[in-house]
Structure formats: structure tokens, C-alpha cells
Amino acid sequence: SEVEYRAEVGQNAYLPCFYTPAAPGNLVPVCWGKGACPVFECGNVVLRTDERDVNYWTSRYWLNGDFRKGDVSLTIENVTLADSGIYCCRIQIPGIMNDEKFNLKLVIKPAKVTPAPTRQRDFTAAFPRMLTTRGHGPAETQTLGSLPDINLTQISTLANELRDSRLANDLRDSGATIRIG
């Protein structure tokens, strides 16, 4: 079954997907699509990379991480209820039946009418279970979506603020990771 991710209307949603290139710059094509992964490619493609660059994208969909290092996590800007559903991340690894496919379920909740409390800046205090979920296996690792009651948009925002820190690296490594080579 799909791993579930949540965001609120008006926020940015974050759907993690990672692989480890065999060598720096040795990229493989990746596609993101709305709908479960079909036999090949992605249905209703919203973003695509090739061996060098992002070669197709649609408005509101972008890669916030360093895709040249294998971070192909999708950010959906300013989500609406219509963005709910299954998304496919497909890593098109050369070879016989090597493609890696991840179906991620995005649930969009209506925006809270009550003002949000001041955001906690201490990452480990805000998400005490976060750093226990890291995985370094060669296949799919524990993902953020399996942790209950965590606002992934908030995590994504914090990750951006802490991009150069070790905590951000921990966050980035916690998504589905494929090592190639």
C-alpha cells in the first residue's frame, strides 16, 4: 500500500523520492506523475528529468533538492484539495526490469482557521522521533510518511532552513533511497 503524506490547503506539499547515482553526475531519467505507477513511464506526467537536467515540468511542481545528487523529491506549491491522490515517482534504471517505482498518497486537509502556534525552532524537540527513522539500506528505507501526526510541509520548510546542517542531511536521507551501481 502507498505511504501517506499530508499537507494543508495553501501550503507546499513534499513527496520524498531519492536514489544514489552510481557516480556524480551519472543520472538516470526520473518521472513524476499523478496516478499510480503504470507499466512504464508515469501517468499524467507533471515533471521529468533526463540524464542531465529537468526537461519537463508543469506549474507548481518542482524539485527543491539537488536532483544531481539523486534527490528527486517533489514539491507541489500552494496545494488545493484537488491535489489529493496518488503520485508516482519512477526511477528509470537501465537494465532488465530494474525500474524503481514508488506510489505516494497525498492527503490534503482544509486549512486550519485557528492561527498556528509559533513554530518550534529546535528540530529534535519539534520532531523527537525523526532521527530514529534513518535508513541506509540499498533498497527502500523508512519514510517520513509512516510517522503519524507530522506536518510534512513544516518538515520540508525546516529542511530548507537547515539545508547545510547535519539535521537536513538526516531528513534528506530518510526518504525512499535507491543506490545504483
Epitope: 512504464f40 513511464e41 499524467n44 526537461n55 528509470q92 537494465g95
Partner: antibody, heavy 120, light 107 residues
């Protein structure tokens, strides 16, 4: 417009290897965006997907043929090929090569098909 | 593997009539279903992809509908060149599979 043409022997002996080539014209086989596939149709019967190789080098084989099947690309000749080993009479069919546009699947191109008979 | 069952096996109609062809999947294929037309001695021709989208160059009289397990191909008014065999194909799960076909013949 992409055009495809199958070529290969029309008669193969049992236990031998069936080899077919599909020559692509009107486009480069190495350019991104296409899946190069093989499908077959037994006489008077329906269609059976054999497998494909993608522009990125991903290869998928149908499980029932996987142990006997090889699909490969020769970019220098703008061709892709099918090799099916240890053939029997059950492999007698019209073999089609085809290309599928990966950018939305809204068009595909097929060869005219070639009949391969397995018989001694 | 996913089994696609097409009905009826044969449809006898006259030019100008409406043809309705059915395809049922043994499990959900979402909207990843295509329809092909095949005439004797010719390769299949893609008509519909993703259940309801007409392929490039396909006339508007061809339409597809459905999702999940039940799909329909409709030809609103049969032209003489439409008499052929029609196959559905699922692209949801490997291996790709085709239905057994529906032959649309002249009444």
C-alpha cells in the same frame, strides 16, 4: 514520422533461436521519448505483448518468455532486435515491432509485421 | 496477470449505427487502458489511451470511457472502414495484456 520495418527469417527450426530486427527510419532510436517494443499474434488469435526496451535502457520482458528472450538496441544501425531461444511450434506467429511515444502515450507506430513459422 | 474480458465477441451492425464495445478487467487498472483497431493483414492501430483520450489522428466518432475495471469503446456512427477487430489493452500492471477482441462485422 517514425516508420518501422521488421526483418528476419520466416522459417525457424524447433530448438533454434528466432532472431528478428526492426529498422527505424524517420527518427533516431537513441533520442529520448520512445519505448521500442515487440508484440506477437498467433495465427487467428489475439495479441501478446513480448517486451520493450526504453530510451533510457530499461528493459521489460513478459514473464512467460523471460527465460528465452533478449531485446537489445543497436544505435549505430538505428535498429532494435528480438532473440527468442529454444523455439517450438507454439512460437509460430506474426511478430510486430512498435514504438510508443512516452510523452503521454498519445501515438504509437507499428511495423507491418512478419510471419515466423517454427517447423522442421 | 490481469485478464481482460471483451464482450461481445462479435457485433453485427450496419453502417451509421452506434457500436458499444465492453472491456472488463479482472482487477483495477485505474485509467491505464488503451483500445486498438486491427484490420486483416494489418498491424494494430491505437485509438484510445488512458481510457478516454483519443490518439493522434483518430476521428471524433471514437470515444472511450470507464475506469477501474469496466471500460467502454463507443463508435457513434459506424463508417465502412470501421468494420474490424477491436482490442483493449491494460498498461497498469506488468505484463501488459490484451483482451480477446471484439469483431465488428457488417450486418
Amino acid at each position: 514520422q517514425v516508420q518501422l520495418q521488421e526483418s528476419g527469417p520466416g522459417l525457424v527450426k524447433p530448438s533454434q533461436t528466432l532472431s528478428l530486427t526492426c529498422t527505424v527510419s524517420g527518427g533516431s532510436i537513441s533520442s529520448g521519448g520512445y519505448y521500442w517494443s515487440w508484440t506477437r499474434q498467433h495465427p487467428g488469435m489475439g495479441l501478446e505483448w513480448i517486451g520493450y526496451i526504453s530510451y533510457s535502457g530499461s528493459i521489460y520482458y513478459t514473464p512467460s518468455l523471460k527465460s528465452r528472450l533478449t531485446i537489445s538496441v543497436d544505435t549505430s544501425k538505428n535498429q532494435f532486435s528480438l532473440k527468442l531461444s529454444s523455439v517450438t511450434a507454439a512460437d509460430t506467429a506474426v511478430y510486430y515491432c512498435a514504438s510508443l511515444d512516452s510523452w503521454g502515450s498519445n501515438r504509437d507506430y507499428w511495423g507491418q509485421g512478419t510471419l515466423v513459422t517454427v517447423s522442421s | 496477470e490481469i485478464v481482460l474480458t471483451q464482450s461481445p465477441a462479435t457485433l453485427s451492425l450496419s453502417p451509421g449505427e452506434r457500436a458499444t464495445l465492453s472491456c472488463r478487467a479482472s482487477q483495477s487498472v485505474s485509467s491505464y487502458l488503451a483500445w486498438y483497431q486491427q484490420k486483416p493483414g494489418q498491424a494494430p492501430r491505437l485509438l484510445i489511451y488512458d481510457a478516454s483520450n483519443r490518439a493522434t489522428g483518430i476521428p471524433a466518432r471514437f470515444s472511450g470511457s470507464g475506469s477501474g475495471t469496466d471500460f467502454t469503446l463507443t463508435i457513434s456512427s459506424l463508417e465502412p472502414e470501421d468494420f474490424a477487430v477491436y482490442y483493449c489493452q491494460q498498461r497498469s500492471n506488468w505484463p501488459l495484456t490484451f483482451g480477446g477482441g471484439t469483431k465488428v462485422e457488417i450486418k
